[in-house]
Interface confidence: low
């Protein structure tokens, strides 16, 4: 019953009801994939092919643009290397991050010659500055991939750029890097499939471990090929990887390599017939819901199946306490290639590999001071044996009977009359957005999903590749190869002209105000607002 959306709006209906604003791209650009939301300045920065845009959050029709192509020489070199002049021999922007109060940091593929630079945006929004620092270009190797088809995950904090990307022309040397800043660049171990095995990077996030910033960790989400012995046949595993922010590599071994890198498998599956689980292993996107405690965000992951025969998508939720428990559990160990993976049962050296050097957890001030046995162990045991299971051990959203797959997710926490609800906006590979609310049943972690809306946001079916949500503007911004779309988070008036219809919608954004279905705001005048998200019961709430 919950698989049928309360509202299903075509692109035409979205336009006619003024519920979508689209930027249909420039003739000489495409690939509007790299988003950076700046709520303070009320701008959405978008990296695309040969361009960087600055859209007004109020209305994306109002925008500024920077043209940043490659030189003719560079383009010709790319063409001579056998690459496609339109699809590959251009500057596809892959990294777009806030560098400081006045500048952004941007990197592009540079026609298979990665390049980075700084973009001046001024001190204040009213400065209206948006320009390329032409005098300051940097080598983009280890920051942006060479190949525009490859995914990159990046995070810029304290002047240091963390990137998960491919560092070579061939797109084989995948690594997690830390560049910029005053320290020597650091990366994952090279040519060791136990560390990374043909990964596809999704996103990177800084999460505090304690009140001591020395314990801060950077988490990377990615999917990769399962190593032989983990699975029979070719398989993909979804992963979460951790790195200590204060990791400066080893002294004698793992010099300028991470010493605290660990990874664990993310499971998102449903029990199937014959006791065989159906796994959603292809991680597509991740959203971190920070609420109250920044140390413990809820992780929302969008997954699809690997199978070509059975197409399905799911959303799974993970708690950081479960993630940390896995990283404190047994390491994965095997006695050689093609051997079975087992939980490591030998002596684990002290301090435990993966622990950040800090005063919180004991004696070592720097990773360079770590004993040799810790480094050696870390080098050879990057994976944890136990996987991270989702909250409630199952997905909160599953779609298997449709002709599309999920690609992106953003989540908004909404105050309603009867509590707080997480509303998910899920992008698909056919250019639609699903609006789903998860409603607690008996316990808060036992959730019911209600599909509120299914909206087509692009004229032609095109995969949604980027999404950002502005709580300030109450708007959703969507990117694809074709362009950028903007839509409000709620369309309460469309639910109908009666209290019962509004109540049955179970949309946390909306309530019956006595005369119309409109945006719900928690106010003192509670009795005048009719809303029931948990049960959607109009009899109780609309009878008078």
């Amino acid at each position: 019953k919950n698989n049928v959306p309360r509202l299903k709006l075509s692109y035409k209906e979205m336009l006619e009801s003024n519920n979508v604003i689209t930027f249909n791209g420039l003739a000489n650009s495409s690939s509007y994939h790299t988003f950076l939301l700046d709520e303070e300045r009320s701008r959405l920065y978008v990296g695309a092919k040969d361009h960087i845009f600055s859209f007004d959050l109020v209305n994306i029709k109002d925008f500024q643009k920077i043209v940043w192509p490659v030189s003719y020489t560079r383009r010709d070199e790319c063409k001579w290397a056998g690459k496609d002049i339109l699809k590959e021999c251009a500057n596809f922007i892959k990294v777009l991050k806030a560098y400081n109060q006045t500048h952004l940091y941007a990197c592009g593929t540079g026609a298979f010659h990665p390049i980075c630079t700084y973009i001046e945006i001024g001190h204040h929004p009213e400065d209206n500055i948006f320009k390329l620092e032409n005098s300051h270009f940097e080598n983009g190797r280890g920051k942006s991939p060479y190949d525009p088809k490859l995914l990159t995950a990046s995070l810029l904090i304290d002047g240091e750029l963390y990137s998960g990307t491919a560092a070579d022309f061939m797109g084989r040397d995948f690594a997690i890097f830390r560049t910029l800043g005053h320290h020597h660049p650091i990366r994952t171990e090279q040519h060791d499939s136990r560390w990374l095995n043909d990964p596809k990077f999704i996103s990177a996030h800084l999460i505090s471990e304690s009140d001591n910033p020395e314990d801060d960790k950077v988490y990377f989400f990615f999917r990769e090929n399962a190593i032989d012995g983990e699975h029979s046949g070719k398989a993909t595993h979804a992963r979460i990887g951790q790195i200590c922010k204060n990791d400066f590599g080893g002294h004698r071994s793992l010099v300028n390599k991470w010493t605290t890198f660990l990874k664990a498998r993310l499971i998102c599956s449903v029990p199937g017939p014959n006791g065989i689980d159906t796994h959603f292993d292809e991680l597509q996107d991740v959203f971190l819901m920070n609420f109250k405690d920044p140390k413990n965000p809820v992780v929302y992951g969008v997954f699809t199946t690997s199978s070509n025969i059975f197409k399905g998508s799911a959303v799974c939720m993970y708690s950081m306490s479960d993630v940390r428990r896995v990283f404190l559990g047994p390491y994965a160990h095997r006695d050689g290639p093609n051997y079975q993976w087992v939980p490591y049962q030998g002596r684990v050296p002290y301090p435990r590999p993966g622990t950040c050097p800090s005063k919180t957890f004991g004696g070592f001030d720097s990773t360079k001071d770590l004993p040799d046995d810790v480094i050696t162990f870390a080098r050879s045991h990057p994976a944890m044996y136990n996987p991270v299971f989702p909250m409630n051990n199952r997905p909160i959203v599953i779609k298997t009977d449709v002709n599309y797959q999920f690609t992106q997710i953003v989540v908004d926490r909404v105050d309603a009359e009867d509590g707080q609800y997480d509303v998910m906006f899920i992008g698909t590979d056919v250019g639609t957005v699903l609006k789903v609310v998860s409603i607690p049943k008996e316990t808060w972690y036992d959730l019911e999903e209600v599909l509120l809306e299914e909206m087509t946001v692009f004229r032609e079916p095109t995969a949604i590749s980027a999404m950002e949500l502005s709580t300030k503007q109450q708007q959703l911004y969507i990117g694809s190869t074709a362009g950028v779309a903007q839509l409000p988070l709620h369309r309460c008036d469309i639910y109908g002209k009666a209290c019962a219809e509004c109540c049955l919608a179970r949309d946390p954004y909306c309530a019956w105000d006595g005369s119309a279905c409109s945006r719900y705001f928690p106010t003192a005048k509670r009795r005048t607002r009719r809303q029931d998200i948990r049960n959607g019961d109009p009899l109780t709430h609309c009878s008078d």
Epitope: H191, D192, S193, R194, D228, S253, H333, R334, D335, G336, P337, N338, Y339, Q340, V342, Q345, G346, R347, D373, T376, F377, R379, S380, H381
Partner: antibody, heavy 120, light 111 residues
Framework: EVQLLESGGGLVQPGGSLRLSCAAS????????MSWVRQAPGKGLEWVSA???????YYADSVKGRFTISRDNSKNTLYLQMNSLRAEDTAVYYC??????????????WGQGTLVTVSS | QSVLTQPPSASGTPGQRVTISCSGS????????VNWYQQLPGTAPKLLIY???LRPSGVPDRFSGSKSGTSASLAISGLQSEDEADYYC????????????FGGGTKLTVL
Amino acid sequence: EVQLLESGGGLVQPGGSLRLSCAASGFTFSSYAMSWVRQAPGKGLEWVSAIGTGGDTYYADSVKGRFTISRDNSKNTLYLQMNSLRAEDTAVYYCARRDDYTSRDAFDYWGQGTLVTVSS
Amino acid sequence: QSVLTQPPSASGTPGQRVTISCSGSSSNIGSNTVNWYQQLPGTAPKLLIYYDDLRPSGVPDRFSGSKSGTSASLAISGLQSEDEADYYCAAWDDSLNGYVVFGGGTKLTVL
């Protein structure tokens, strides 16, 4: 102190059988993968067989179907049962422990070896 | 014929630096770590270098390992007479199920 002591070698006729043993001491035997490596007279090292901590077994093509590796964790002993022996199996047979930190193939301790001679 | 290729012999005078090469393929050295063993005359092999470039405790820092692509090398600096031995490189081979492959060995002579 880690010690590996092989025994059971000797002279055997082609087609015959022999069982090698390797007594381990000074470490938790059950936590380590073990291997047999051989060295023909005047020749280089050749990996023969391995057994993982979980009991999974691996063999070189040259001995597959003829040799059987096993372990008895209660006795801290590794075995190699060699059947249908050939002249080319003549070698010094070493038992070796795989280093538990590297998760790879570094044999950090070796026995002194036992000589197997296959001749009529 | 060994899967990993080493020169059959090498030599040097005391104090000299000697390098022994080990060449493989993408399925062994190219995708797995390399180990080196020293076998003194009449004794069992001894682990000299593991994980491409790490020395077990007790191995002098005159011995160093390195790897690039599908080749590895062992360098011995400040050669001493007691270094006269056979040296073997080894690696897993992913194309063989669970195999460790060894080089043919290099006989090092200290002149």
